[in-house]
């Protein structure tokens, strides 16, 4: 085959070698590109900035060598059109720093970048815990700062990342109010700082207010729905990143809705209770409490980890005539009390009525309209009902 | 696979009490009812108790009630059942055996008691 | 509380021989429980539900009956058979127990 004059020449059946001396200056309209898989660079002393739009459209790149080159400088946001990318060789430029944004979000099994006169500071702290870590081959290069030493050896001890605190309310929210938020933020070295909001959705109207080191938020006409849902934080340094999540009770009262008796390996009655704080439960049978027993009793589905509603069920092993009749599920909580109650029929009754035939659980009387009795439990009582608190 | 682990043999002299443990692998804790069920030497099966790890509702037999204390430690997915006030006719085999939607599906080793003075 | 009485207390069988115990209720309950247990060993669940099989049980253990009435049937003795059985009720608290019915080697 001839060989190739050009300053990019094909290399097997999706990589490009650029190797002719001083030929780039950037990585605009490189041959090809949509389809590389392999780029490598050599002798390239103008090539000085590695950006965004360099490596647009190199969607499918898995390997960049840039060597024995003039890069200088690499852009954060560099790679974000190449989340393919899993090979980095930057070896011998003019490198003295490259952020950790420039490689978050890769999953890189080899970083190179021996040869290159790295200035030793905070912002190099993620790239010597990759090193003390053992992470994309980084110790074997033995880094060096140019005039420092090792990298190893420098001193870290105040290369932290931003340090947030979120303040929330103490006092209850309720559905409605509006709710102000604030994220204090240091350390040194500030540079970004935010809010993540992706989660509220319809949950509340938001305002965002002052910036660093101190940033509001205000959720104004808070709806119940806000509640289990994350606000988040975040802020950046030239060491890392901080994120604190905070989530807001809006207290709202019990609700509960019975359905159906049906038959799931054995019976269950299902339900759904929702309040916040976490309803109490108590089951009623005709009229009496139900003491529930290790044959009929309260089980709760796995719960959504961002709403405060819980499904469950009144299971009821063994079901026969006896327990037959109308259950009630009582849910209360301190802003309000809510019940619902359903009609089961497990068995028709074999028998007559035979005075003797065991009542399968234990009842007490209770008034209906009263709320919820203490949760609390004594574990040498056999207590008088059964509460279980929800959440 | 679902195994109860019983704690050793214990001999105590009539009055005090005795604290038998049983610690669960192989399923969700939470989940089951943990029963206690003893046997005295040459007898039949008794009943003392059910507790439900998932919120600490314990049932207990009335014969038992005011000396046998059930209990759950659920970061470490055991169940304990305490008995006071030992007399020589406590002497027996302690179990403990799990249900969920089922009796007893599966049961402890067994933890012998011995009440001597 | 619902007390179980088994009959008989013991009995002397052969292998191969067809086996019923009967578990009769003080008062009615939906179904009936059984347990064989060897000695020095602990129960081990072998019908449910009066006559489900418990999973590694032979076929030839069944469970029938209703109200106060139940049995538990062998129809052909195995050597492993030769056991202690309880029969149990899961409707009432507290939980009850047959008293057992041995079952010994002719």
């Known amino acids: 085959a001839a060989p190739c004059p050009d300053a990019c020449c094909p290399h097997g059946s999706s990589g490009l070698r650029c190797t002719r001396d001083g030929a780039l200056d950037s990585l605009h309209h490189l041959p090809g590109a949509e389809n590389l898989t392999e780029l490598y660079i050599e002798n390239q002393q103008h090539l000085q900035h590695l950006e965004l739009r360099d490596l647009r459209g190199l969607g499918e790149l898995r390997n960049l060598t840039i060597v024995k080159s003039g890069l200088r400088f690499v852009a954060p946001d560099a790679f974000h059109f190449t989340p393919r990318l899993s090979r980095l060789n930057l070896s011998f430029n003019a490198l003295e720093s490259l952020s950790w944004k420039t490689v978050q979000g890769l999953s890189l099994q080899e970083l190179v970048l021996s040869g290159n006169p790295l200035h030793c500071s905070c912002a190099l702290r993620w790239l010597q815990r990759w090193e003390e870590e053992g992470l994309g081959g980084v110790p074997e290069q033995k880094l060096q700062c140019h005039g420092q030493g090792p990298l190893a050896h420098m001193p870290n001890a105040s290369c932290g990342v931003p340090t947030l605190k979120v303040q929330v309310p103490n006092a209850s929210v309720d559905v409605g109010d509006d709710v102000l938020l604030r994220c204090q933020v240091e350390g040194r070295g500030l540079e970004q700082a935010g809010w993540i909001l992706t989660e509220l959705e319809q949950s509340a109207t938001v305002m965002k207010s002052g910036g660093l080191p101190s940033l509001g938020l205000t959720l104004a006409n808070v709806t119940s729905d806000l509640n289990r849902k994350n606000v988040t934080c975040w802020a950046e340094n030239d060491v890392g990143r901080a994120e604190v999540s905070v989530q807001v009770n809006v207290s709202f009262p019990a609700s509960v809705q019975l359905h159906t008796a049906v038959e799931m390996h054995h019976w269950c009655i299902p339900f759904s209770v929702d309040g916040q704080p976490a309803p109490s439960l108590r089951w009623l049978f005709n009229g009496s409490v139900l003491n529930e027993t290790s044959f009929i009793f309260t089980e709760f589905l796995e719960p959504a980890a961002n709403e405060t509603v819980r499904h469950g069920c009144l299971r009821l092993n063994q079901p026969t005539h006896v327990n037959n009749g109308n259950y009630t599920l009582l849910a209360a909580n301190p802003f309000g009390q809510a019940s619902a109650s359903i009609m089961a029929a497990f068995m028709d009754n074999p028998f007559e009525f035979n005075p003797e035939d065991p009542i399968p659980v234990s009842f007490s009387p209770v008034d209906t309209n009263s709320t919820s009795g203490d949760p609390v439990e004594k574990k040498d009582e056999t207590p008088f009902g059964v509460s279980v608190a929800v959440g | 696979q679902v195994q109860l682990v019983q704690s050793g043999a214990e001999v105590k002299k009539p009055g005090a009490s005795v604290k038998v443990s049983c610690k669960s692998s192989g399923y969700t804790f939470t989940n089951y009812w943990m029963h206690w069920v003893r046997q005295a030497p040459g007898q039949g099966l008794e009943w003392m108790g059910e507790i439900y790890p998932n919120n600490g509702r314990v049932n207990y037999n009335e014969k038992f009630k005011n000396r046998v204390t059930m209990t759950v430690d659920i970061s470490i997915s055991t169940a304990y059942m305490e008995l006071s006030r030992l007399r020589s006719d406590d002497t027996a085999v302690y179990y403990c055996?799990?249900?969920?939607?089922?009796?007893?599906?599966?049961w402890g080793q067994g933890t012998t008691v011995t009440v001597s003075s | 509380q619902v007390q179980l009485t088994q009959s008989p207390s013991s009995l002397s069988a052969s292998v191969g021989d067809r086996v019923t115990i009967t578990c009769s209720a003080s008062?009615?309950?939906?179904?009936m429980h059984w347990y064989q247990q060897k000695p020095g060993k602990a129960p081990k669940r072998l019908i449910y539900d009066t006559s489900k099989l418990a999973s590694g049980v032979p076929s030839r253990f069944s469970g029938s009956g209703s109200g106060t009435d139940y049995t538990l049937t062998i129809s052909s003795l195995q050597p492993e058979d030769f056991a202690t059985y309880f029969c149990q009720q899961w409707s009432s608290i507290p939980l009850t127990f047959g008293q057992g019915t041995r079952l010994e080697i002719k």
């Open positions: 008062s009615s309950v939906g179904y």
């Open positions: 055996a799990r249900s969920r939607y089922d009796p007893m599906e599966d």
